[in-house]
């Protein structure tokens, strides 16, 4: 299995829709695999750091990443210090939402994309797309995307160059 998240970084305004794209390829496909999307909260305060890019903390982060390519300090930490939840699973055409997400308009569409019709405050975090197949155990079966949900009053311009926040609708 080879799982790919084509766009690993998403910033969205509260209540707006978002799709986290995930695709997979398999060497053998006798049965359809299970697609599992998991949520993990950020290891550090991603949003606060995003609004203070010149801080000493962020400079240290930059040094760390420079010395360790591919290491993401907001994503790489033990599960004991963050919240972990199953968002949704898909087997065949059946999509099942995790307990915490019951009643939300969330689904797995296309190959393995996770779609939120409407984002909520607690949705900021890291979303892991994993594909499980008993027939194909080789390769990389997991990839992740970061999602940041901002309020209308947040300094959106810093995170979304050229973004224009319209008036809040009723």
């Amino acid at each position: 299995i080879q799982v790919t998240v084509s766009d690993p970084y998403h910033v969205v305004i509260l209540f707006q829709p978002v799709t986290l794209p995930c695709t997979y390829q398999m060497t053998s496909t006798p049965t359809q695999p299970i697609v599992i999307w998991k949520y993990k909260s950020f290891c550090r305060d991603r949003i606060a750091d995003a609004f203070s890019p010149a801080s000493v903390d962020n400079q240290l982060n930059a040094q760390l990443v420079a010395g360790n390519p591919g290491y993401n300090p907001y994503v790489e930490c033990q599960d004991s210090v963050r919240t972990v939840r199953v968002v949704a699973t898909k087997q065949g055409n059946a999509v099942t939402l995790g307990d915490y997400y019951q009643g939300r308009r969330i689904t797995i569409t296309g190959n393995a994309d996770l779609t939120f019709d409407e984002t909520a405050w607690g949705d900021s975090g890291v979303y892991y797309c994993s594909v499980v197949s008993a027939q194909d155990l080789e390769g990389n079966n997991e990839a992740y995307a970061e999602l940041i949900v901002l309020g209308r009053t947040s300094g959106v311009a810093e995170l979304l160059p050229g973004f224009q926040a319209g008036p809040m609708e009723d």
């Epitope: 290891c43 606060a48 903390d57 290491y71 790489e76 004991s80």
Partner: antibody
Amino acid sequence: QVQLVESGGGLVKPGRSLRLSCAASGFTFSSYAMHWVRQAPGKGLEWVAVISYDGSNKHYADSVKGRFTISRDNSKNTLYLQMNSLRAEDTAVYYCARDSPGNAFDIWGQGTMVTVSS
Amino acid sequence: DVVMTQSPLSLPVTPGEPASISCRSSQSLLHSNGYNYLDWYLQKPGQSPQLLIYLGSTRASGVPDRFSGSGSGTDFTLKISRVEAEDVGVYYCMQALQTWTFGQGTKVEIK
């Protein structure tokens, strides 16, 4: 500069309680997970507890589970360790430490001594 | 629980000479992200511990380049290329993959 300062240690009788504090300065405290680590006299280091940056997740060593509670007040840049039902084997220097990338402890306080004795 | 075993427990050294400390874990510390979750700390006499090496081989900020970490999976080594008098103290390895566990410590002292 970046600093952690522990306080609240002292002599306490077995079965009693004590609350340790750790005051942070020089960095964005609310962005980091924080730990307590202890060291019994003449012994090695033992990890005690961790709390996530926003206080929503906590984890404890088996030796203190159910007796110790880690908490934080980000508005005061302070970490706490509430220690109940203290035992003689809890006697140690208690350090607070900052969680850094790689799950390492990059900043340590000077430590505060807790002695549990009748 | 992951058990960490250090050797030797005591290491007499000569200034200017190299020194090496070994650390073995009861299970692999290699994460799927390609990094080893193994750190090295030095606790100088009467002081708090200080971070030397994290993620197996990355030197912490301000740590002299005479310190280096190597290894992968379950076997790790801390090397000091040329020991200086200020390097005396107790060295601890620590795994950070599943909660946190320290080795027993290696006491480094000048011969």
